[in-house]
C-alpha cells in the first residue's frame, strides 16, 4: 500500500493509473466503500462522501489513463485509506494528514518560550525535527518547546514530520519581537545635542503600546521617569515627560528621543520599556550616556567624564600633533601648567577614539619686574 | 465546434467599472470550468480569474481580488467577468478561456479577446 | 505564487530548421506545464498539455519534454505558419502562471 503524507491546508494529488493509455471508467472510494468522484464518459461524476466540495480530479489526464484525486484543504480527518478502481483493480493509497502549529501567537517576546504542536492522525507516531533560522535543531514527538528565544530565532522555521520512511516539511514564520541592540552607549561633549534612538528588530502592519523611558543619573541617588509615551499604529505621542531635562520625542518609528544638551548631571543610564498590546511581558532596551568636560581654571587643565565608562577605557590630555602628556584609566585627568596652543581630551578604547573635546590654551604673558 | 464569442469592451477611466461577457457554442457549457486571461501591453499573459463548472469555486490572483468577480449563467451559456475599481495597469486583451475539464486543468479553448482600456 | 522564467524572449531561426523553447519554474510544478501558439488578433492555441501530449490535430513537429522545475518546447521542421509568440503555463495549483513569451521570428 501506498504512503502519501499531506498538510493541514494543503492540497494533495492521489495517483491511479491504468495499464491503458485511454479513457476509461474509474472510480475514487474510501475506506467506508464511499464513492468519492469517478467518470461517466468524459465527465465527473462525485459520490455522497464528506470530500464532496473538496474532491477533484484532472480531466485532461484520463486520456493518458491518469486518474488522479485532488484533495484540496486538508483536515487531520481526511487521513484514510483511498481505493481507486480502474480496470477490474483496485490501488489502495493510504493518506496520512499532519498539521503543525505553534500554540501561541507567532509573534513572541525575546525571552519568552515557543511551543510547537503537532497535530496527526489516530494510529500514527510520526517524529519531528525542527530547524531554527540560526540552524540550531530541535527534536521532539507530539510538542516541541523553545524557552527563551532570542533575536536570532525570528524567521523561517523548518519543521520535517517523518512516518512511515516518508516526510512532510512544514515552515512557520516566526517573529521574536525585541529592540535591534539590546544596549546602547552615546558619548557626548558637554553641551551637544543628544540623539537616543530605539530601532525595533521587526515590522508589522500596527504596532500599538506603550512605554517610558526610566533614568539613573550617575550623580542621583535614585532613577527618575523621564518621559512616558503611547504608540498606536506605529504614531508616537508623548504623554507625560519631565521638565528637566526636557526630552523631545519623535512621532513615528523608529523610537527616537533627543536631549537638548549634554550636561555632566544626565550623564548614566537609562531603560526603555515598551509594552505592547495583547502581549504579555515587555521590550527593553538599556541606552547609557557619556558625557566629557574639559576646562581651564588658573594652571589647571582639566578633562573629565561622567557615565557609565569601561574601566579599560583610556582619558588622555594631549597638545595638538604631540604626544599625551597624560593618559589613565581614570574618569579626569589633568595637567599643571599646560604649554600655549590647541590641547585635546581623548576617551578611546583600544587605540579608537570614542569622544573628543579640544580646548585651546592661550599663552600666559609675565608681567615685567619694574627696577 | 467549440465557438467563445466576447463582448463588452470598453475605454473606462480610473475607478471606473465594466461587464465583460462569453458567450459559448459547441460544447455543453455546465460541464466545464472557465476562465479569463489578458493580455498587457507588454504582450504578458495573465489569469485573472476562474470558475468552476457549477459555480462552486471562484478563484483570483491578488492583483485583481476584491475588484473582479467572475460568473456563469448556465442556462444562457455565458461567463461574465464583473470588473470594479479599475487601475490604468488593468489596460488589456481579456480572453474568455474554457478549461479542459475541471478547476485544476490547463485552457484548451479561448475567445477572439476583447479590449479594454483604463484611461483619463 | 510560482513563477515561470520563460527564455529567449525572442529568436530567429530558418525555414526546415529546429528552435527550441526554455521554461523554468521556481518550484516543482509535477509535468503540469502547457505550452501555447498566440498569432495577433487570435485567442491562444494549447498546443501541449502535461509536459509532452500532443492535443489532437497538433502537427508532431512540436514536442515538448522535462521535469520538476524544467521544462523545454521544441518546433523543428520550422515553417512559416510557426511565426507567433509561444507561452508556458504552470497549472500545479490553482493560481496559473504564464512564462513571459517567446516570439518566433523567421530568418
Known amino acids: 500500500k501506498k504512503v502519501v503524507l499531506g498538510k493541514k491546508g494543503d492540497t494533495v494529488e492521489l495517483t491511479c493509473t491504468a495499464s491503458q493509455k485511454k479513457s476509461i471508467q474509474f472510480h475514487w472510494k474510501n475506506s467506508n466503500q464511499i464513492k468519492i468522484l469517478g467518470n461517466q464518459g468524459s465527465f465527473l461524476t462525485k459520490g455522497p462522501s464528506k470530500l464532496n466540495d473538496r474532491a477533484d480530479s484532472r480531466r485532461s489526464l484520463w486520456d493518458q489513463g491518469n486518474f488522479p484525486l485532488i484533495i484540496k484543504n486538508l483536515k487531520i480527518e481526511d487521513s484514510d485509506t483511498y481505493i481507486c478502481e480502474v480496470e477490474d483493480q483496485k490501488e489502495e493509497v493510504q493518506l496520512l494528514v499532519f498539521g503543525l502549529t505553534a500554540n501561541s501567537d507567532t509573534h513572541l517576546l525575546q525571552g519568552q518560550s515557543l511551543t510547537l504542536t503537532l497535530e496527526s492522525p489516530p494510529g500514527s507516531s510520526p517524529s519531528v525535527q525542527c530547524r531554527s533560522p540560526r540552524g540550531k535543531n530541535i527534536q521532539g514527538g507530539k510538542t516541541l518547546s523553545v524557552s527563551q528565544l532570542e533575536l536570532q530565532d525570528s524567521g523561517t522555521w523548518t519543521c520535517t514530520v517523518l512516518q512511515n520512511q516518508k516526510k512532510v516539511e512544514f515552515k512557520i514564520d516566526i517573529v521574536v519581537l525585541a529592540f535591534q541592540k539590546a544596549s546602547s552607549i552615546v558619548y557626548k561633549k558637554e553641551g551637544e545635542q543628544v540623539e537616543f534612538s530605539f530601532p525595533l528588530a521587526f515590522t508589522v502592519e500596527k504596532l500599538t503600546g506603550s512605554g517610558e523611558l526610566w533614568w539613573q543619573a550617575e550623580r542621583a541617588s535614585s532613577s527618575k521617569s523621564w518621559i512616558t509615551f503611547d504608540l498606536k499604529n506605529k504614531e508616537v505621542s508623548v504623554k507625560r515627560v519631565t521638565q528637566d531635562p526636557k526630552l523631545q520625542m519623535g512621532k513615528k518609528l523608529p523610537l527616537h528621543l533627543t536631549l537638548p544638551q549634554a550636561l555632566p548631571q544626565y550623564a548614566g543610564s537609562g531603560n526603555l520599556t515598551l509594552a505592547l498590546e495583547a502581549k504579555t511581558g515587555k521590550l527593553h532596551q538599556e541606552v547609557n550616556l557619556v558625557v566629557m568636560r574639559a576646562t581651564q581654571l588658573q594652571k589647571n587643565l582639566t578633562c573629565e567624564v561622567w557615565g557609565p565608562t569601561s574601566p579599560k577605557l583610556m582619558l588622555s590630555l594631549k597638545l595638538e600633533n604631540k604626544e599625551a602628556k597624560v593618559s589613565k584609566r581614570e574618569k579626569a585627568v589633568w595637567v599643571l601648567n599646560p604649554e600655549a596652543g590647541m590641547w585635546q581630551c581623548l576617551l578611546s578604547d583600544s587605540g579608537q577614539v570614542l569622544l573628543e573635546s579640544n580646548i585651546k590654551v592661550l599663552p600666559t604673558w609675565s608681567t615685567p619686574v619694574q627696577p | 465546434e467549440v465557438i467563445l464569442v466576447q463582448s463588452g469592451g470598453a475605454l473606462v477611466e480610473p475607478g471606473g467599472s465594466l461587464k465583460l461577457s462569453c458567450s459559448a457554442s459547441?460544447?455543453?457549457?455546465?460541464?466545464?470550468?472557465m476562465s479569463w486571461v489578458r493580455q498587457t501591453p507588454e504582450k504578458r499573459l495573465e489569469w485573472v480569474a476562474a470558475?468552476?463548472?457549477?459555480?462552486?469555486?471562484?478563484y483570483y490572483p491578488d492583483s485583481v481580488k476584491g475588484r473582479f468577480t467572475i460568473s456563469r449563467d448556465n442556462a444562457k451559456n455565458t461567463l461574465y467577468l464583473q470588473m470594479n475599481s479599475l487601475r490604468s495597469e488593468d489596460t488589456a486583451i481579456y480572453y474568455c478561456?474554457?478549461?479542459?475539464?475541471?478547476?485544476?486543468?490547463?485552457?484548451?479553448?479561448w475567445g477572439q479577446g476583447t479590449t479594454l482600456t483604463v484611461s483619463s | 505564487d510560482i513563477q515561470m522564467t520563460q527564455s529567449p524572449s525572442s529568436l530567429s531561426a530558418s525555414l526546415g530548421g529546429k528552435v527550441t523553447i526554455a521554461c523554468k519554474a521556481s518550484?516543482?510544478?509535477?509535468?503540469?506545464i502547457a505550452w501555447y501558439q498566440h498569432k495577433p488578433g487570435k485567442g491562444p492555441r494549447l498546443l501541449i498539455h502535461y509536459t509532452s501530449t500532443l492535443q489532437p490535430g497538433i502537427p508532431s513537429r512540436f514536442s515538448g519534454s522535462g521535469s520538476g522545475r524544467d521544462y523545454s518546447f521544441s518546433i523543428s521542421n520550422l515553417e512559416p505558419e510557426d511565426i507567433a509568440t509561444y507561452y508556458c503555463?504552470?497549472?500545479?495549483?490553482?493560481?496559473?502562471?504564464f512564462g513571459g513569451g517567446t516570439k518566433l521570428e523567421i530568418k
Open positions: 503555463l504552470q497549472y500545479d495549483n490553482l493560481l496559473f502562471t
Open positions: 478561456a474554457r478549461k479542459y475539464g475541471g478547476d485544476y486543468d490547463p485552457f484548451d479553448y
Open positions: 518550484q516543482d510544478i509535477n509535468n503540469y
Open positions: 470558475i468552476s463548472d457549477h459555480s462552486t469555486n471562484t
Open positions: 459547441g460544447f455543453t457549457f455546465s460541464n466545464y470550468a
